[in-house]
Amino acid sequence: QPSVSPGEPSPPSIHPGKSDLIVRVGDEIRLLCTDPGFVKWTFEILDETNENKQNEWITEKAEATNTGKYTCTNKHGLSNSIYVFVRDPAKLFLVDRSLYGKEDNDTLVRCPLTDPEVTNYSLKGCQGKPLPKDLRFIPDPKAGIMIKSVKRAYHRLCLHCSVDQEGKSVLSEKFILKVRPAF
């Protein structure tokens, strides 16, 4: 948790005091924000945002869609966050299927994970079709898979996010990449 000099406003404290938390689907999420100047909790995942004016955020039966970033803010505008993964073997990905890239720029395939401890988090072509040999990516369980330096040849590429679960590949819904030329 953050520490500052006496007299200076300090960011709120969150319990549990860790940056990431993994809970199982159906279990309780209980997050406490300790700050005399508490203002609100904010929850964010993909394009969804929710607010809560209670200093204790309680979700009695967690679902995969409760996966995301929980931020507590105080009256000084200072904040602290915890990221919660709700592990659901039946829903490994949260998905926003819009996928646009500009040639030579990176673009994000938005398929954050509900379980950060899965393996082989990667991209697969649709219907077993090969991906471009030069395609490279950066995986981030909280955001998705960033395709590096999108090529014009990737336009209309159909792909899935993929992970391995108990020895089998599990695929997300499909994405179609639209590429804008650089000029």
Partner: nanobody, 126 residues
Framework: EVQLVESGGGLVQAGGSLRLSCAAS????????MGWFRQAPGKEREFVAA????????YYADSVKGRFTISRDNAKNTVYLQMNSLKPEDTAVYYC???????????????????WGQGTQVTVSS
């Protein structure tokens, strides 16, 4: 330019364990990926495991899943391969590989990695 130095190989009995280390000197970025490959005499170099530097996401060959664990220490620029329940067929020279351009879509293809170590011998006796 990136230099990779492997260590930790040796002779072990079937069922035993070894931990390999690969120390990288040079710049590691968020795009970095480091992996382990192995090559047995007369065979092609094969993928074992890889890890993305930024998020620590892990990738494994089916043949080692559940037995081998790849991990990283960012502060030391080092990647580890913990090998448990070793089998005679795990005998090979183990090579550390790295690339600064991101995880290849075909991360098991050794031709897609730019930097290689000299290798460390692992021998599993029955």
């Amino acid at each position: 330019e990136v230099q990779l130095v492997e260590s930790g190989g040796g002779l072990v009995q079937a069922g035993g364990s070894l931990r390999l280390s690969c120390a990288a000197s040079g710049r590691t970025s968020g795009s970095y990926v480091m992996g382990w490959f192995r090559q047995a005499p007369g065979k092609e170099r094969e993928f074992v495991a890889a890890i993305s530097w930024s998020a620590g996401m892990t990738y494994y060959a089916d043949s080692v899943k559940g037995r081998f664990t790849i991990s990283r220490d960012n502060a030391k620029n080092t990647v580890y391969l913990q090998m448990n329940s070793l089998k005679p067929e795990d005998t090979a020279v183990y090579y550390c590989a790295a690339d600064q351009r991101g995880v290849p879509a075909y991360y098991s293809d050794y031709a897609l990695y730019d930097y290689w170590g000299q290798g460390t011998q692992v021998t599993v006796s029955s």
